[in-house]
């Protein structure tokens, strides 16, 4: 799990030999004396491999912990296998000409040796107690101390591949997965939104007049809002299409129903790439000497903690998450409709939360382990959450969609915006997720807009 492998120079050789060991039929074409179709199609039974010089002979593979010294002389005769020397191993039956070099745990990454290398098993590297693995790539991890959630509570405990998820006490805000006092909140930072209610409350106690005026203001405000709401209903269709073109840069929305497949496709990993960072004398450690790491397939909670906060027109961007990210994959970061648009000519209020596509995009991009917290913050009760989960039975995605639909139905149209969702995501230190949502809805940059999601 997250182990280092062989040095770069050995990798092509190792890959070839592994290929020979695991997929003999797929490698026959690489053997000089075997050319025609019939020979290539001949396959030995399990546990045996084709003799490289004579495809009519099947030799027995070597056991794990050993390597091939000499091929078997003939049918039914033993293969000459030798035990791996110290510092090398083979973890499965094979016909490798050399054993694989044992991995070394990366001290500079804080890794410790969980178990030593033996002839039939590679070194197992891990982290110390109260540390988690931050994966920079599929096979490269670094150890970091778990957050203690001082001035807050542990929402999700620290796990092997994920930092603690903290919820801060009142008067504190989350910054780099630590609860920081609101007294450290500068006006230019996003924390002003989190710390504002507290400041307002203090002012409220000083001025008793507000207690009388506030309900009146709210009452008249609601009346005004309802009038505006009715007026907007009439202009709704026109407004919606204009909004779409502003947010997604597309003139006319296409028909609904093209929801899936709009997010960015990951690049195909380079098959020749060595997943092992190598050392170079001048530059020190090279995280990836050639090209690519494939990403781990599991989705980890906190995958997009406040990775790329929106740039404000005046204030500098708020940087929230830890450089190594509070996630399993050390993982986050896309443009969102929450920020004040950089192009001052276009300042949309929201994306349309009436559109199923918007809600599905939210479902897809909020980390599953943070979902309940997310909908609770939107105002759904545990009872409602449980009821909707039961109603939708096995389909979690539909249950999550129903939760958002419930929230949208009960929230006034002007308030049920992606901006509100964005504020909640920001409070949860998941602002990067909002970028993912917009990328899902509007398509990635430098590509033609994705199929329209908004009607």
């Amino acid at each position: 799990m997250g182990l280092s492998t062989v040095p770069d120079l050995l990798l092509p050789l190792v890959l070839l030999e592994l290929l020979v060991g695991i997929y003999p039929s797929g490698v026959i074409g690489l053997v000089p004396h075997l050319g025609d179709r019939e020979k290539r199609d001949s396959v030995c039974p399990q546990g045996k491999y084709i003799h490289p010089q004579n495809n009519s002979i099947c030799c027995t593979k070597c056991h794990k912990g050993t390597y091939l010294y000499n091929d078997c002389p003939g049918p039914g005769q033993d293969t000459d296998c030798r035990e791996c020397e110290s510092g090398s191993f083979t973890a499965s039956e094979n016909h490798l000409r050399h054993c694989l070099s044992c991995s070394k745990c990366r001290k500079e990454m804080g890794q410790v040796e969980i178990s030593s290398c033996t002839v039939d098993r590679d070194t197992v590297c891990g982290c110390r107690k109260n540390q988690y693995r931050h994966y920079w790539s599929e096979n490269l991890f670094q150890c970091f101390n778990c957050s203690l959630c001082l001035n807050g509570t542990v929402h999700l405990s620290c796990q092997e591949k994920q930092n603690t998820v903290c919820t801060c006490h009142a008067g504190f805000f989350l910054r780099e997965n630590e609860c920081v006092s609101c007294s450290n909140c500068k006006k230019s930072l996003e924390c002003t939104k989190l710390c504002l209610p507290q400041i307002e409350n203090v002012k409220g106690t000083e001025d008793s007049g507000t207690t009388v005026l506030l309900p009146l203001v709210i009452f008249f405000g609601l009346c005004l809002l309802s009038l505006l709401f009715i007026g907007l209903m009439y202009r709704y269709q026109r407004w919606k299409s204009k909004l779409y073109s502003i947010v997604c840069g597309k003139s006319t929305p296409e028909k609904e129903g093209e929801l899936e497949g709009t997010t960015t496709k990951p690049l195909a990993p380079n098959p020749s790439f060595s997943p092992t960072p190598g050392f170079t004398p001048t530059l020190g450690f090279s995280p990836v000497p050639s090209s690519t790491f494939t990403s781990s397939s599991t989705y980890t909670p906190g995958d997009c903690p406040n990775f790329a906060a929106p740039r404000r027109e005046v204030a500098p961007p708020y940087q929230g998450a830890d450089p190594i990210l509070a996630t399993a994959l050390a993982s986050d970061p896309i443009p969102n409709p929450l920020q004040k648009w950089e192009d001052s000519a276009h300042k949309p209020q929201s994306l349309d939360t009436d559109d199923p596509a918007t809600l599905y995009a939210v479902v897809e991009n909020v980390p599953p382990l943070r979902w309940k917290e997310f909908v609770r913050r939107l105002g759904l009760s545990d009872h409602e959450i449980d009821r909707l989960e039961l109603q939708n039975g096995r389909c979690l995605r539909e249950a999550q969609y129903s939760m958002l639909a419930t929230w949208r139905r009960r929230t006034p149209r002007r308030e049920a915006t992606l901006e509100l969702l964005g504020r909640v995501l920001r409070d949860m230190d998941l602002l990067g997720c909002l970028e993912d949502i917009e990328e899902a809805l509007c398509g990635p940059a430098a590509l033609p807009p994705a199929p329209s999601l908004l009607r």
């Epitope: 790491f293 929106p310 961007p317 990210l325 994959l329 050390a330 443009p335 970028e435 430098a446």
Partner: nanobody, 118 residues
Framework: EVQLLESGGGLVQPGGSLRLSCAAS???????MGWVRQAPGKGLEWVSS????????SYADSVKGRFTISRDNSKNTLYLQMNSLRAEDTAVYYC?????????????WGQGTLVTVS
């Protein structure tokens, strides 16, 4: 073939400036990108990231206010403007393409460019 090629590193005095560039090829330059550095004998440290359209940027506390990340999608190039450089900024700087949906994890990296502040 995917390639990320960094340039612009070198020796600079404390307080000086450098501009790193990263030329991308072999893939559509429409993903979030980032810079990660590694000081001699230390682990990797995330430095900065930028969203696909360049609207959103994020920085490590250690470089905030001094470094600026930007991109030119028409040129398939990522930049890191480094001002007020300090000795502790000495590191190999890697340009990397982020794995979609995976936060600060990257699936393509450059070879790195060495920045020495001395």
């Amino acid at each position: 073939e995917v390639q990320l090629l960094e340039s612009g590193g070198g020796l600079v005095q404390p307080g000086g400036s450098l501009r790193l560039s990263c030329a991308a090829s072999g893939f559509t330059f429409s993903y979030r990108m980032g810079w990660v550095r590694q000081a001699p004998g230390k682990g990797l440290e995330w430095v900065s990231s930028i969203s696909s359209r360049g609207r959103h940027t994020s920085y490590a506390d250690s470089v905030k206010g001094r470094f600026t990340i930007s991109r030119d999608n028409s040129k398939n190039t990522l930049y890191l403007q480094m001002n007020s450089l300090r000795a502790e900024d000495t590191a190999v700087y890697y340009c990397a393409k982020r794995v979609p949906g995976r936060g600060r994890s990257f699936d393509y990296w450059g070879q790195g460019t060495l920045v020495t502040v001395s």
